[in-house]
């Protein structure tokens, strides 16, 4: 029989225990006499033990000893040992040796007194100290047979009390992060790099992150140490949007009055100088030339009309030179030039007429004759029974070098209410009506209009050889741009090196600061893709602004409306960039106005076409778009539509 735990504990108190041991020894002698030397009955055994539980435990086993060794009377020593061991239930020891401090024999029972950390009836069960309040450990409690110990997470160490943990400062080791910055964290540490760099644990160093591999940019991406820049197809009419990653359309921010008049004929459409209109008159009846039209221009030079036969026969050319009408004529191979009348390139409408009379030609401005030239012959020339006359408007049907006096044929002018040979001309009217490019802006002012769809370029030289022979030639680029922009992004002026397909220099409007990644309206001066200077500009105010750029050996300045721009490079970088520019200037470069050719978008900060009015002065010389090596046909060389008046 087992005793309840509380009674067993009380039973084991030291004083009781000493009495119990005395009693046990007495009991052992009594058992010797009654049951070892003699054969005892259950009742006799009860008298030895003085209780039923021990008797009940003892007696069946006593009978087993008799069966095994014979009766007491056989005097078998094995029998005596067998019986003597029966009342001591700790022999053999039933308790677990590893976990037991002592085994105590009880009346028909035993009690295993366990060592610390062990439990169970036989002291064979490990006590999990970690299950209660984590064994007193601050972080990790490790249970083990009969014991436990505390430990700490990585980055912490065990305090001297064996229970609490304290943080290890890994940054105390200067090699922890190598080149990177070390930051201690509770139980850990972090190796930090500047934005745009990532820590390499193998190299223990900060390495540039190639953001371009992450596909951040919508179009073109350029990685740089610690950063990246996105570029959009400016020539395709796109610019960076607010997030500096995606692209958006370059939209006009100032509305220009670009409405056209369907009853007008624009003479400056063909940059090649070829006529905008070619008319073929043929008559059975001899006829004289009569031409009358209203005309408006700011252009000082160009061809209004040609009338006659082929270049070696008889013809006249009505042109404009220095703002005045000029008549060039060739009759039967003999050429003449006459110029007279008022300056008419004032931008206002006036009526001009050419009339072929019996023996002379009369030119009138607003019905007043300004030229009367005696001629010998007719403009209509007979051929196979028919009289022929070719009439071209805005150009001549042969090369301008074959004129009596060469002239730039390109004329940015406008014609309306035309009348050729007193005839009703439905042909031109119908053609003009369906072709807006043949129409003029309803209203124009002085200047040149860049529609945001093309450029002009010139072949100019920027090297200056001093008068004293043998000295080094110097260079200079000085640009003054009078601009009235219609959009916030576009190239004003640029140099292009065709051989290297590089953009040695550009001045442009841009609506963001690329390095600061900040939306801001600026004028940028750059050598190749590097911005040298920036200046803020109120680009969408509809007002005229003056952008001045001056570059020469050792200096580069950018001014907007008289205020000097901010330099974006160090003095050393500036010298290096100017040296690059000078190298380019020693090779052939083309001067671009209003845009760039098809260059990679990374060649310059801006590749978009300029939209708005602009006049350019380069090295103190006004650039005339009629004198360009090439001009996009939508750029008007000497006229610009005004800003649309604000709606009331």
């Amino acid at each position: 029989a087992l005793l309840p735990a509380r009674e067993a504990t009380q039973f084991l108190r030291p004083r009781q225990r000493r009495a119990f041991q005395v009693f046990e020894e007495a009991k052992q002698g009594h058992l010797e006499r009654e049951c070892v030397e003699e054969l005892c009955s259950r009742e006799e055994a009860r008298e030895v033990f003085e209780n039923d539980p021990e008797t009940d435990y003892f007696y069946p086993r006593y009978l087993d000893c008799i069966n095994k060794y014979g009766s007491p009377y056989t005097k078998n020593s094995g029998f005596a040992t067998c019986v003597q061991n029966l009342p001591d239930q700790c022999t053999p020891n039933p308790c677990d040796r590893k976990g037991t401090q002592a085994c105590q024999d009880l009346m028909g029972n035993f009690f295993c007194l366990c060592k610390a950390g062990w439990g169970g009836r036989l002291c064979d069960k490990d006590v999990n100290e970690c299950s209660q309040e984590n064994g007193g450990c601050l972080q990790i409690c490790h249970n083990k047979p009969g014991s436990f110990h505390c430990s700490c997470h990585s980055g912490f160490e065990l305090s001297s009390d064996g229970r609490t943990c304290q943080d290890i400062d890994e940054c105390a080791d200067s090699e922890a992060c190598g080149e990177a910055r070390c930051k201690n964290l509770p139980g850990s540490y972090s190796c930090l790099c500047d934005e745009g760099f990532a820590y390499s644990s193998q190299e223990k160093a900060c390495r540039d992150v190639d953001e371009c591999l992450q596909g951040r940019c919508e179009q073109v991406c350029v990685n740089s140490p610690g950063s990246y820049t996105c570029h959009c197809d400016g020539r395709g009419g796109l610019k960076l949007s607010q997030d500096m990653d995606t692209c958006e359309d370059i939209l006009p921010c100032v509305p220009f009055s670009v409405a056209k008049s369907v009853k007008s004929l624009y003479l400056g459409r063909m940059f090649s100088g070829t006529p905008v209109i070619r008319l073929r008159f043929k008559r059975l009846q001899p006829t004289r030339l009569v031409a009358e039209f209203d005309f408006r221009t700011f252009d000082p030079e160009g061809i209004l009309l040609f009338a006659g036969g082929h270049q070696d026969s008889t013809w006249i050319v009505l042109a404009l030179r220095a703002g005045r009408l000029e008549l060039q004529l060739r009759y039967n191979g003999v050429g003449r030039v006459t110029s007279s009348g008022p300056v008419i390139n004032h931008g206002m409408w006036q009526t001009i007429s050419v009339e072929e009379l019996a023996r002379n030609l009369v030119i009138k401005v607003n019905r007043d004759a300004v030229m009367k030239i005696a001629v010998a012959g007719d403009l209509f020339q007979p051929e196979r029974g028919l009289y022929h006359l070719n009439l071209t408007v805005g150009g001549i049907p042969f090369h301008e070098k074959d004129l009596v006096q060469p002239i730039n044929p390109r004329l940015d002018g406008c014609m309306r209410s035309w009348n050729w040979l007193n005839g009703e001309d439905t042909t031109i009217q119908e053609t003009v009506k369906v072709n807006t490019r043949m129409q003029c802006f309803s209203v124009t002012e002085r200047g040149s209009f860049y529609p945001g769809s093309g450029f002009a370029f010139y072949s100019l030289d920027y090297m200056r050889t001093p008068l004293d022979v043998g000295t080094e030639s110097t260079w200079e680029v000085e640009v003054v741009a009078h601009i009235r922009p219609a959009a916030d992004t576009g190239v004003l002026f640029a140099l292009w090196a065709p051989d290297l397909r590089a953009v040695p220099l550009s001045v442009a409007l841009v609506d963001y600061h690329s390095t600061k990644k900040l939306k801001k309206q600026l004028v940028v001066l750059a050598v190749e893709h590097t911005a040298l200077a920036l200046m803020e500009i109120k680009v969408c105010d509809g007002q005229e602004h003056v952008v001045t750029v001056s570059l020469r050996d050792g200096e580069a300045t950018l001014e907007v409306d008289g205020t000097r721009g901010q330099s974006e490079v160090s003095a050393a970088q500036l010298q290096e960039r100017l040296a690059v520019l000078e190298r380019h200037l020693r090779s052939p470069v083309l001067t671009f106005a209003g845009g760039l050719p098809d260059v990679p978008v990374t060649s310059a900060p801006v590749t978009a076409f300029y939209r708005g009015c602009m006049t350019l002065e380069v090295n103190r010389r006004l650039l005339d778009l009629d004198e360009a090596a090439y001009k996009h046909s939508d750029i008007t060389a000497h006229s610009c539509p005004p800003v649309e008046p604000a709606a009331a």
Epitope: K282, R283, L284, P286, R384, L386, N422, G423, E424
Partner: antibody
């Protein structure tokens, strides 16, 4: 608006004469010559010639020399075609057309029928 | 005198068909060829003038090409209103001469 309006159809006997008119409006009559074109029934077009409206001088093609006369009355901006000694083969529609080297403006045509 | 040989004299086509008429001249006339359309009881209408020039208001389905002695007139996709007679006229030299004509009929 430029208009050329011709006189109405005529039925004539062989050997008779006929004079058809072409009234011009909408432009300076003397600036452009006047042409005459014949079209026999179911046949093609034939240029007969023209008249200088400045001088009144006519020009006839070989086929139409002799019995055909072009004339003018500039005061009423009208051109005339007269055919004398009519023959059956003169049966046709006759058109006037303004001279532009080619013909843009035409009269509506006058049908002359020659039949006994 | 410059004579014009126009062919075919007639052709039957369906609406939407392409029509090609040729005119060959006996002399080189440069590009001084004109093309006319004539409907019954009406005067001819100038469609294309010298230099293969389409006249104002004439639909773009009408076109012409050629220079020298060989000329072609084309209707790219015949419409119901295009069934008529067509003539070529040379205006290079006097006397002015017409082709014999081509009748474009409905098939």
């Amino acid at each position: 608006q430029i208009h050329l309006v011709q006189s109405g159809p005529e039925l004539k006997k062989p050997g008779a004469s006929v004079k058809i008119s072409c009234k011009a409006s909408g432009y300076t009559f003397t600036n452009y010559g006047m042409n005459w074109v014949k079209q026999a029934p179911g046949q093609g077009l034939k240029w007969m010639g023209w008249i200088n409206t400045n001088t009144g001088e006519p020009t006839y093609t070989e086929e139409f020399k002799g019995r055909f006369v072009f004339s003018l009355d500039t005061s009423v901006t009208t051109a005339y075609l007269q055919i004398s000694t009519l023959k059956a083969e003169d049966t046709a529609t006759y058109f006037c057309a303004r001279d532009e080297g080619w013909f843009v403006y035409w009269g509506q045509g006058t049908l002359i029928t020659v039949s006994s | 005198e410059t004579t014009l040989t126009q062919s075919p004299s007639s052709l039957s086509v369906s609406t939407g068909d392409r029509v090609t008429i040729t005119c060959i001249t006996s002399t080189d006339i440069d590009d001084d060829m004109n093309w006319y359309q004539q409907k019954p009881g009406k005067p001819p209408k100038l469609l294309i003038s010298e230099g293969n020039t389409l006249r104002p208001g004439v639909p773009s389905r009408f076109s012409s090409s050629g220079s020298g002695t060989d000329f072609t007139f084309t209707i790219s996709s015949t419409q119901p209103e295009d069934f008529a007679d067509y003539y070529c006229l040379q205006t290079d030299s006097v006397p002015l001469t017409f082709g014999q004509g081509t009748k474009v009929e409905i098939k």
